[in-house]
Amino acid sequence: PEPPTACREKQYLINSQCCSLCQPGQKLVSDCTEFTETECLPCGESEFLDTWNRETHCHQHKYCDPNLGLRVQQKGTSETDTICTCEEGWHCTSEACESCVLHRSCSPGFGVKQIATGVSDTICEPCPVGFFSNVSSAFEKCHPWTSCETKDLVVQQAGTNKTDVVCGPQDRLRA
């Protein structure tokens, strides 16, 4: 018979032959042959593989480093990685939660809508027209543009969401 060019789901092609993939939680020891099945071995204590695979090495479980404020939220298994979270009152810097911050800052152009608490991180909002923020801050709101008119001045340079307006003297009409 013709050697296969494609294999079924949960199989892989090797030496013109379809072999079974190893199930999650197990790694490949040896490919199948005409006479033997694929040989797989369970991952070790601190290892995992989360897909049907032909990997010869399992992945190490993630380490939740207490020096970075991390703790284990969910212990890893042979089929799943460890999930880290931050100590109470701290917040993950990313979805992967690789490190912790007390709270995040709002970038220039954004103001703080709500200051962080033990359970929720800083909530930022874009500065609307007429307001600006030129700093990165975890507490400062957007500031209103300076009103040149109330100072008997005129706008020399328009404001943006990151910069205040620049006021200047009014041009005096020559007689």
Epitope: L68, G69, V101, L102, S105, S136, S137, F139, E140
Partner: nanobody, 116 residues
Framework: EVQLLESGGGLVQPGGSLRLSCAAS???????EMWWVRQAPGKGLERVS?????????YYADSVKGRFTISRDDSKNTLYLQMNSLRPEDTAVYYC?????????WGQGTLVTVSS
């Protein structure tokens, strides 16, 4: 690597005052937003006060407004918290934290105990 060292804590009677200091070394201090946070025994972290990098803007938690004053001296790389009219509920370990607020920028804290 930045190091923050808090000092000035101690035992004080209700109604008394304390001035906490936070000395920063190993990193630029000027221009960075700074916070004082506290942790009472068996409680979570509470954000107490903050000061902008320029020193022009400040924030105070409602629980300390009118009693605490935050300030900074960039020439000395030091942050301060003047605490007046202290109450038993102000008892906590006080920490200063520097932008970007990562866990490894965390000092050892200074213990404030308000008790008669």
């Amino acid at each position: 690597e930045v190091q923050l060292l808090e000092s000035g804590g101690g035992l004080v009677q209700p109604g008394g005052s304390l001035r906490l200091s936070c000395a920063a070394s190993g990193s630029t201090f000027a221009g960075y937003e700074m916070w004082w946070v506290r942790q009472a025994p068996g409680k979570g972290l509470e954000r107490v006060s903050a000061i902008s990098g320029s020193g022009g803007s400040t924030y105070y938690a409602d629980s300390v407004k009118g009693r605490f004053t935050i300030s900074r001296d960039d020439s000395k790389n030091t942050l301060y918290l003047q605490m007046n009219s202290l109450r038993p509920e102000d008892t906590a370990v006080y920490y200063c934290v520097k932008d970007p607020y990562s866990f490894d920028y965390w000092g050892q804290g200074t213990l404030v105990t308000v008790s008669s």
